[in-house]
């Protein structure tokens, strides 16, 4: 018996070949003895019923010359995995067809974080093994079942599942869409009084989108976290439902998602958590956001630097007069010089690699006030 | 591409010096921090210090404060451990490694050098 | 300094396993640590940053977690050349420390 492994939705090629390699009369049959198609001497293709119940069954005519009879079944159905028969040449040829079917849980557009769950259905009596692998390489094997927790942004694209079952395989293709925003936490370092910018991309696209969001922030001055701003989404547009008095946050009408901030200042420095809850999906996304704010005041013979947020504590704070060394480095969240000489002072925020924040301050003579570029 | 070689190891006593190199090439040198890192035979991996990217701050594990000093020379993308009252405990292999700092937020070392055999030995 | 404790010390396991190994920060280190794999006669290779972030190259069946002063390094279902020493880095603070390291040896 030979077996043939098929897809569901898609067609199947069961071969039958003659001795002769020339055409001749055949029949194709269902193991009950129900005539689907043959070739009865004439070269015409003759159906064994109704063109509506024999519609997704064909051969190909231009292999009979060849001696190749072959039964071509479309739009293959699970129902379709049976015992087929086809007669020539006083012989009987039996060929199973197996039908196979993976479906992924419910829905192929996943939030970052739950579970892909991808089935495999197949014919009774055949005992398959199964394989898929990620777009970014993993691979999963199992029974019929097979569970990737916890799925990242990587597992978005086209899984590929090999069904093996007596050494042939069939291959399937699932596109995976991971919800998600392009990066799970960002940091934003400014001075005092600069305009802040705060971007959420995310990291797929589809035709409509539609949900709702919020913003809450963490101020570190803060006891307890507030809601900065409440959003609505319509296919891609983005409306603000409710937003705090202070700060008066503005939110652009498009996506990506964008927040500004009129003014950077110490009592805004923090930690904020956007969520995003998109129609027709159960949990939200999240992207974390960090504001980091330094301020460089002079008042009478001191001159200080402050930054107030969420910094690293390997973070270095220094005070130096422009293109001399640093008067004073500290691991701290403030540092300061007393007496400062006048020029023009730098403050600055710097780690093991590069200055990340930088706030110049002019100090005058004495008998003068400072000036704040 | 981005490498890193390290150079000057060797047999030396108790109470003597040494001074190790690492050549960097690939990459812009003057932008990234850079750590020693090394490990005794049969023991785990040991940090050992970091420059910061302008040189102007060093920071040291307690075993070698005092003794060790990291520095760096961004003209000619090297990195240096000056080891001075060397003790045989710090026998090891001696690499040099890269630190990668992402908005001050996120830190890794992704390259390393094949390191350099430093024995201590009367 | 920060003590990192990692355990186990030592474990044997097979090809296809999956293993876990843990780290503990003597005090909170947010998501300051990484995991460096090391194999004899080479040099130490970066697979896990900030807590759970996989570096580029790195196969896909490392995966890294946690938050604070608990973290876990998973290898999903090991191949023949994973078999090496994982070591856990705090870099959250100056001086760095590495955990005593996990040999991971083949049953």
């Known amino acids: 018996k030979t077996l043939v492994l098929g897809k569901e939705g898609e067609s199947a090629e069961l071969p039958c070949e003659s001795s002769q390699k020339k055409i001749t009369v055949f029949t194709w049959k269902f193991s009950d003895q129900r005539k689907i198609l043959g070739q009865h001497g004439k070269g015409v293709l003759i159906r064994g019923g109704s063109p509506s119940q024999f519609d997704r069954f064909d051969s190909k005519k231009g292999a009979w010359e060849k001696g190749s009879f072959p039964l071509i079944i479309n739009k293959l159905k699970m129902e379709d995995s049976q015992t087929y028969i086809c007669e020539l040449e006083n012989r009987k040829e039996e060929v199973e067809l197996w039908v196979f079917k993976v479906t992924a849980n419910s829905d192929t557009h996943l939030l970052q974080g739950q579970s892909l769950t991808l089935t495999l259905e197949s014919p009774p009596g055949s005992s398959p093994s199964v394989q898929c692998r990620s777009p970014r390489g993993k691979n999963i094997q199992g029974g019929k079942t097979l569970s990737v927790s916890q799925l990242e942004l990587q597992d978005s694209g086209t899984w590929t599942c090999t069904v093996l079952q007596n050494q042939k395989k069939v291959e399937f293709k699932i596109d995976i869409v991971v919800l998600a925003f392009q990066k799970a936490s960002s940091i934003v370092y400014k001075k005092e009084g600069e305009q802040v910018e705060f971007s959420f991309p995310l990291a797929f696209t589809v035709e409509k989108l539609t949900g709702s969001g919020e913003l809450w922030w963490q101020a570190e001055r803060a006891s307890s976290s507030k809601s900065w701003i409440t959003f609505d989404l319509k296919n891609k547009e983005v409306s603000v439902k409710r937003v705090t008095q202070d700060p008066k946050l503005q939110m652009g009408k498009k996506l990506p998602l964008h927040l500004t901030l009129p003014q950077a200042l110490p009592q805004y420095a923090g930690s904020g958590n956007l969520t995003l809850a998109l129609e027709a999906k159960t949990g939200k996304l999240h992207q974390e956001v960090n504001l980091v704010v330094m301020r460089a005041t002079q008042l009478q013979k001191n001159l200080t630097c402050e930054v107030w947020g969420p910094t690293s504590p390997k973070l270095m704070l220094s005070l130096k007069l422009e293109n001399k060394e640093a008067k004073v480095s500290k691991r701290e969240k403030a540092v300061w010089v007393l007496n400062p000489e006048a020029g023009m002072w730098q403050c600055l925020l710097s780690d093991s690699g590069q200055v990340l924040l930088e706030s110049n301050i002019k100090v005058l003579p004495t008998w003068s006030t400072p000036v704040q570029p | 591409q981005v490498q890193l070689v390290e150079s000057g190891g060797g047999v030396v006593q108790p109470g003597r010096s040494l001074r190790l190199s690492c050549a960097a090439s690939?990459?812009?040198?003057?932008?990234?921090?850079m750590h020693w890192v090394r490990q005794a035979p049969g023991k785990g991996l040991e940090w050992v210090a970091i420059?910061?990217?302008?040189?102007?701050?060093?920071y040291y594990a307690d075993s070698v404060k005092g003794r060790f000093t990291i520095s760096r020379d961004n003209s000619k993308n090297t990195l240096y451990l000056q080891m001075n009252s060397l003790r045989a405990e710090d026998t090891a292999v001696y690499y040099c490694t890269r630190e990668v700092a992402l908005e001050g937020y996120y830190y890794y070392m992704d390259v390393w050098g094949k390191g350099t055999t430093v024995t201590v030995s009367s | 300094a920060i003590q990192m404790t990692q355990s186990p010390s030592s474990l044997s396991a097979s090809v296809g396993d999956r293993v876990t190994i843990t780290c503990r920060a003597s005090q909170g280190i947010r998501n300051g640590l990484g995991w460096y794999q090391l194999k004899p006669g080479k040099a130490p290779k970066l697979l896990i940053y900030a807590a759970s972030s996989l570096q580029s190259g790195v196969p896909s069946s490392f995966s890294g977690s946690g938050s604070g002063t608990d973290f876990t390094l998973t290898i999903s279902s090991l191949q023949p050349e994973d078999f090496a020493t994982y070591y856990c880095l705090q870099d959250y603070n100056y001086p760095y420390t590495f955990g005593q390291g996990t040999k991971l040896e083949i049953k």
């Open positions: 420059i910061w990217y302008d040189g102007n701050n060093k």
């Open positions: 690939g990459f812009t040198f003057s932008s990234y921090g």
